[in-house]
């Protein structure tokens, strides 16, 4: 079987205050079993983002239908973009366990940094 | 619906220490980074600390840094405040309150702990 | 570090009538602000957020606008369990999460 992949094409991303930023991931594999999740930052001090699961996540939309059996886009779209938000995002994926799921595997990131201030 | 209830306030000396619980119920608390915000008596709002969801990122006032820490248990839905070498102008209600998202406003707010420093 | 400044300190109102609260900031927060309400004896309440959305559950009586430096909370006809402390609380910027100093609105 294939080995697990995560892509995250873009090493960085210039995002405009105030707009909206696709952040990309993709998988290489279904297997294991488990959820993507999406952080700001490494290591204990890194921020969740996003949690398909559980939380409510308002500034952020998925670009594809997660819930669909064979997905492997987990992108996501983060708006309203303030200067609080900048920092380098990880999609990492999760294998199911009991009583909590594992962190597998992290794309390799993408630093978010501000570009050209809004007209 | 969200509930958040502070304890552990009370009356200590100056030099003393006080530790500050929150229990919260009624959302994904481990989704959610968490704050404390003191209001001292006939004063506005002075925000205090931030945790991030994971527990693993910190940020502090810098009237309370090297003095007080934050922490939270994710399994007890628990936050938590230590507050050592307490000083007079200390003195004040102590609120716990949820954050919107991991960049944003508080959207729930505790009862409040009243916490006295006097000798 | 953006400094929140609220005027007037104390506003006086008859019930019926438009109060009209100001927050200004010493730099932009964009559309980052957010307004609370405090009444005597209990804990903050959140009214509006993104400087014109109101919370869930909040009559529409309460209005935000502005964006930038400066931001107006409205009570379009004020009743008198608006009698409170209003706070701004700006997130563009943090740490620190700052609030403004309050305005104390009064009932006539």
């Known amino acids: 079987e294939e080995e697990l992949q995560m892509i995250q094409p873009e090493k960085l991303l210039l995002v405009t205050v105030g707009k909206t930023a696709t952040l990309h991931c993709t998988v290489t594999s279904l297997l294991p079993v488990g959820p993507v999740l999406w952080f700001r930052g490494v290591g204990p001090g890194r921020e969740l983002i996003y949690n398909q699961k559980e939380g409510h996540f308002p500034r952020v939309t998925t670009v594809s239908d997660l819930t669909k059996r064979n997905n492997m886009d987990f992108s996501i779209r983060i708006s309203s973009i303030t200067p609080a938000d900048v920092g380098t995002y990880y999609c990492v994926k999760f294998r199911k366990g009991s009583p909590e799921n594992v962190e597998f595997k992290s794309g390799p990131g993408t630093e978010m940094a501000l570009g050209a201030k809004p007209s | 619906d969200v509930q958040l209830v502070e304890s552990g306030g009370g009356v200590v000396r100056p030099g003393e220490s006080l530790r500050l619980s929150c229990a919260a119920s009624?959302?994904?608390?481990?989704?959610?980074?968490m704050n404390w915000v003191r209001q001292a008596p006939g004063e506005g709002l002075e925000w205090v600390s931030r945790i991030n969801s994971g527990g693993g990122g910190t940020d502090y006032a810098e009237s309370v840094k090297g003095r007080f820490t934050i922490s939270r248990d994710n399994s007890e839905n628990t936050l938590y405040l230590q507050m050592n070498s307490l000083r007079a102008e200390d003195t004040a209600v102590y609120y716990c309150a949820k954050q919107y998202d991991w960049n944003g406003f508080f959207d729930y707010w505790g009862l409040g702990a009243l916490v006295t420093v006097s000798s | 570090e953006t400094v929140l400044t609220q005027s007037p300190a104390t506003l006086s109102v008859s019930p019926g009538e438009r109060a009209t609260l100001s927050c200004r900031a010493s730099?932009?927060?964009?559309?980052?602000l957010a307004w609370h309400q405090q009444k005597p004896g209990q804990a903050p309440r959140l009214l509006i957020y993104?400087?014109?959305r109101r919370a869930t559950g909040i009559p529409d009586r309460f209005s935000g606008s502005g964006s930038g430096t400066d931001f107006t909370l409205t009570i379009s006809s004020l009743q008198t369990e608006d009698s409170a402390v209003y706070y701004c609380q700006q997130y563009y910027y943090w740490p620190p999460y700052r609030f403004g100093g309050g305005t104390k609105v009064e009932i006539k």
């Open positions: 730099q932009t927060v964009g559309s980052k």
């Open positions: 009624g959302f994904s608390f481990s989704s959610y980074a």
């Open positions: 993104d400087a014109s």
